[in-house]
């Protein structure tokens, strides 16, 4: 969490941002909040990006003002106009690209004063893994698949019964480049699986960590998966 304050002269206002990550090809949110103002027409929101000459986005007098927007963001940005009045200056970024990563500044002017805060935005690809029993294999085998990751992640297997065991010798992981030549499909196979155990396939890069669990008993198979973005800190 980054909290920024305005500088001397007129009054300053508090602006708060949260570091976040964007999934390539999907829409992302750059979070920013500020001390609200009672009049929408008095609020100016400007988003800047380090290394970019023009503005990322500008909202003033109750509407978008995009005449000075940098071309790399053209048609891809929006604020939540109905939430500006309550102090939400968050930016929606459409079709996130790898090059959108970097340092952004949320700059706010209201009738009370001005303030700004920086935000680190990471970009990559991350997806939920799915773990299944591989019935094609000759022995009891689990297959963990996740369709889109970037940068290349690490894959680690763990089990509830054999806690602390190293499964690297009995697993095999491959990365297959997807058609857009950036993201990759992750496939990991775990051999010599025992019944009545819960196995976890953990996929992690510097942006996200995802886990796919599978509980294998004689009578049933239960699956669960979750994904967590790393390093989301507020400013």
């Amino acid at each position: 969490l980054i909290i920024g304050f305005g500088i001397s002269g007129r009054h300053s206002i508090t602006v708060t941002t949260v570091a976040s990550a964007g999934n390539i090809g999907e829409d992302g949110i750059l979070s920013c909040t500020f001390e609200p103002d009672i009049k929408l027409s008095d609020i100016v929101i400007q988003w800047l990006k380090e290394g970019v000459l023009g503005l990322v986005h500008e909202f003033k007098e109750g509407k978008d003002e995009l005449s000075e927007q940098d071309e790399m963001f053209r048609g891809r940005t929006a604020v939540f106009a109905d939430q500006v009045i309550v102090g939400n200056a968050s930016l929606r970024l459409k079709n996130v690209q790898l090059t959108d990563a970097g340092t952004y500044k949320c700059y706010i002017i209201t009738s009370k004063g001005k303030g700004n805060a920086n935000l680190e935005y990471k970009t990559g690809a991350f997806s939920m893994p799915e773990v299944n029993v591989d019935y094609n294999a000759s022995s009891e085998t689990l297959r963990c698949e996740a369709p889109r990751w970037f940068p290349q992640p690490t894959v680690v297997w763990a089990s509830q019964v054999d806690q602390g065991a190293n499964f690297s010798e009995v697993s095999n992981t491959s990365f297959e480049l997807n058609s857009e030549n950036v993201t990759m499909k992750v496939v990991s196979v775990l051999y010599n699986v025992t019944i009545n155990n819960t196995y976890s396939c953990m996929i992690e890069n510097d942006i996200a960590k995802a886990t796919g669990d599978i509980k294998v008993t004689e009578s049933e198979i239960k699956r669960r998966s979750h994904l967590q973005l790393l390093n989301s800190k507020a400013s």
């Epitope: 500088i7 002269g9 800047l48 380090e50 500008e58």
Partner: antibody, heavy 117, light 112 residues
Framework: QIQLVHSGPELKKPGETVKISCKAS????????MNWVKQAPGKGLKWMGW????????TYADDFKGRFAFSLETSASTAYLQINNLKNEDTATYFC??????????WGTGTTVTVSS | DVVMTQTPLSLPVSLGDQASISCRSS???????????LHWYLQKPGQSPKLLIY???NRFSGVPDRFSGSGSGTDFTLKIRRVEAEDLGVYFC?????????FGGGTKLEIK
């Protein structure tokens, strides 16, 4: 198109005063701090300080405290540098430069000031 | 004040060659926030300076990938992979970690 356009060259005598302008266009003037940089003939660059274009508060580097003054005409998106009691060593090209984050991403065209008796 | 020392003062190169400019600071440029605010500017003859590289290694918008920056702490390098005629001019390193912000003395890149 983002640009900073300076006033023309100045020829002054020692003891006189000069006021240089820097007009900004193509971006919201009060969002970015305006810096001033001195370049003496055949020499490197020296940061003089900056002015907060929102509040109008100037900050001067130690070597430029006293005879130097930064000011604004916000309605005209213009920053000014005034040098009082000119000395021969003030002969230089002066640049305004837009501060974005921690660097100068747009520089003015520069104004050459010559001080000679 | 932080003193920025550039070497060489003058760098004669042939077009198509690689050029390398060194910049050394009198104290570490690592800010308390973890960032290193070392930048490179190019001033072509008769023009104002232009930003090339910010924060050690980040190319500014529109700067060709022939230009790359590296280094840490007090030692930094700018490399130009294949020098073109439009690259000629004076290169300045600059720090904005410590106030006052300071510049190196410049390195003149010229044709051999």
């Amino acid at each position: 198109q983002i640009q900073l356009v300076h006033s023309g060259p100045e020829l002054k005598k020692p003891g006189e005063t000069v006021k240089i302008s820097c007009k900004a266009s193509g971006y919201p003037f009060t969002t970015y701090g305006m810096n001033w940089v001195k370049q003496a003939p055949g020499k490197g660059l020296k940061w003089m300080g900056w002015i907060d274009t929102y509040s109008g508060v100037p900050t001067y580097a130690d070597d430029f405290k006293g005879r130097f003054a930064f000011s604004l005409e916000t309605s005209a998106s213009t920053a000014y540098l005034q040098i009082n009691n000119l000395k021969n060593e003030d002969t230089a090209t002066y640049f305004c430069a837009r501060r974005s984050f921690w660097y100068f991403d747009v520089w003015g065209t520069g104004t050459t000031v010559t001080v000679s008796s | 004040d932080v003193v920025m020392t550039q070497t060489p003062l003058s760098l004669p190169v042939s077009l198509g060659d690689q050029a390398s400019i060194s910049c050394r600071s009198s104290q570490s440029l690592v800010h308390s926030n973890g960032n290193t605010y070392l930048h490179w500017y190019l001033q072509k003859p008769g023009q104002s300076p232009k930003l090339l590289i910010y924060k050690v290694s980040n190319r500014f918008s529109g700067v060709p990938d022939r230009f790359s920056g590296s280094g840490s702490g007090t030692d930094f390098t700018l490399k130009i992979r294949r020098v073109e005629a439009e690259d000629l001019g004076v290169y300045f390193c600059s720090q904005s970690t410590h106030v006052p912000w300071t510049f190196g003395g410049g390195t003149k890149l010229e044709i051999k």
